[in-house]
């Protein structure tokens, strides 16, 4: 299931009616579309120009992260007279066009959708050959991707004054609530959230103390579901053994 | 009615850091793109950036990386611009500015609505 | 980045003469955007999308062009047109402003 949000123009400069673009560069791309981890995407980008009927060399691109200066994800290439834009580049081969340069569209496809592409991207179009000209959406779309909780790592680390703390580390989009539950701590006592810095989707709960042997259970839940992992805690001759 | 009311006026030190504000009101405010534009006594327009409000994304000016910092806060409905190691350089009316419409190229509009400006002297 | 060229930078005009204002891009724009300025005061939105008078804008004044070449042109100047016109473009990274057109009344 794709989302796009469709974004209702508040044009508050006057209410002429405004001549049609088909003369000039410009670019229409959606604020944002959404898409869960694992399904496929489509990033619409259609666009106008002002050279009518051109039948020469383009190219099509699409970036990630920045206009004008992202990396590029995708890249292909139609010759002269063709509706062909061959492919050139296809970051991890998950990108594919799914509009048709020659008709003004730019249209991009994500597969296999992971939560490292939820980012802006950037279409651009290229002519080369007896007009030189190119234009790029310079706010772009953002792929908003989202996930269910996948707990990435939990674990037991020694602390100082022969303790014990568990740390649980998950990702999730929106960023999980993560709980803890074990021996003598009660029912889910609830931990605090801190996404870690640059790592906007990882969510990390530590608790801090360990005070008895078991099983320490880390629960992880968003809107699109939850998630749990378990460690334990054995204290034989100062040592612990844990297990997941 | 759409409003952009800028923060007052700012006396600071050279070397030292100001950040300024501008709270926008009459109008959704993670719809439009805010910009920030600076223009010295006696000079023109310079443009330092834009925010997205609604995911805080940013697009500076290169001249500006390093010196502007664009952020927002949501619930408040007030964009900031901090400007750090200020010098006389630094001098100027910064206006913030509502962009056009959302991501469309072709329904961008310009800027259609200006804050009244906050002077920045910068001074020992 | 593309630098935008207004000319004159200073001009005066008398009531009821027709002024044009020149803006040059150094590489092709898709629109110019006009904004009018007075001493003391907040830039004001004129002209957008090359063509589109902002709300307000008494209708005498237009605006026109393409590709690199722009202007803003007043048929028949007024006292209440005296103030600095700005052209910008938003067309490529970084948005860049001209330096300024400013219009006396004579």
């Known amino acids: 299931f794709v989302r796009t949000k469709i974004d209702t123009t508040e044009n508050l400069l006057n209410t002429e009616v405004h001549s049609s673009p088909a003369q000039r560069w410009s670019m229409q791309v959606p604020p944002e579309v959404s898409a869960e981890a694992g399904d496929a995407a489509v990033l619409p980008c259609t666009f106008t120009h002002p050279h009518r009927h051109y039948d020469g060399p383009l190219t099509a691109i699409w970036r990630a992260g920045e206009p004008y200066a992202g990396p590029q994800v995708f890249r292909c290439a139609a010759a002269r007279g063709s509706e062909l834009c061959q492919t050139a580049l296809s970051l991890h081969g998950r990108f594919r066009l799914l509009g048709n340069p020659r008709r003004n569209d730019l249209s991009l496809r994500v597969e296999r959708l992971a939560l490292a592409d939820d980012r802006r991207y950037f279409c651009r179009v290229e002519f080369a050959g007896d007009v030189h000209d190119r234009y790029e959406s310079r706010h772009g779309v953002r792929l908003h991707v989202t996930a269910a909780p996948r707990i990435v790592n939990i674990s037991v680390l020694p602390s100082p004054a022969h303790a014990f703390r568990a740390l649980c580390t998950a990702e999730g989009e929106p960023p999980p609530a993560l709980a803890w539950s074990g021996p003598a701590l009660g029912n889910s006592l609830a931990a605090v959230r801190s996404p870690r810095e640059g790592h906007g989707h990882l969510v990390t709960a530590e608790l801090p103390a360990l005070t008895h042997d078991g099983r320490y259970t880390c629960t992880a839940a968003n809107s699109l579901g939850r998630s749990e992992a378990s460690v334990y805690l054995f204290r034989f001759h100062g040592a612990s053994g844990a297990s997941t | 009615e759409v409003q952009l009311q800028q923060s007052g006026t700012e006396l600071v030190r050279p070397g030292s850091s100001v950040k300024i504000s501008c709270k926008a009101s009459?109008?959704?405010?993670?719809?439009?793109?805010m910009d920030w534009v600076k223009q010295r006594p006696g000079q023109g327009l310079e443009w330092i950036g834009e925010?997205?409000?609604?995911?805080?994304?940013?697009n500076y000016n290169q001249k500006f990386k390093g010196k502007a910092t664009l952020t927002v806060d949501k619930f408040s409905r007030t964009a900031y611009m901090e400007l750090s190691s200020l010098t006389s350089e630094d001098s100027a009316v910064y206006y913030c500015?509502?962009?056009?419409?959302?991501?469309?190229?072709?329904?961008?509009?310009?800027?259609?609505?200006w804050g009244q400006g906050t002077l920045v002297t910068v001074s020992a | 980045e593309n630098v935008l060229t207004q000319s004159p930078a200073i001009m005066s005009a008398s009531p009821g003469e027709k002024v044009t204002i020149s803006c040059s891009a150094s590489?092709?724009?898709?629109?110019m955007y006009w904004y009018q300025q007075k001493p003391g005061s907040s830039p004001k939105p004129w002209i957008y999308?090359?063509?589109n008078l902002a709300s307000g804008v008494p209708a005498r004044f237009s605006g026109s062009g393409s590709g690199t070449s722009y202007s803003l042109t007043i048929s028949s100047m007024e006292a209440e047109d005296a103030a600095t016109y700005y052209c910008?473009?938003?067309?490529?990274?970084?948005?860049?402003f001209g330096a300024g057109t400013k219009l006396e009344l004579k």
């Open positions: 500015a509502r962009s056009g419409a959302y991501s469309s190229d072709y329904s961008y509009d310009g800027f259609a609505y």
């Open positions: 009459g109008y959704t405010f993670t719809r439009y793109w």
């Open positions: 925010i997205d409000p609604s995911d805080s994304y940013t």
């Open positions: 590489s092709s724009v898709s629109y």
């Open positions: 999308r090359t063509s």
């Open positions: 910008q473009q938003w067309s490529s990274n970084p948005l860049t």
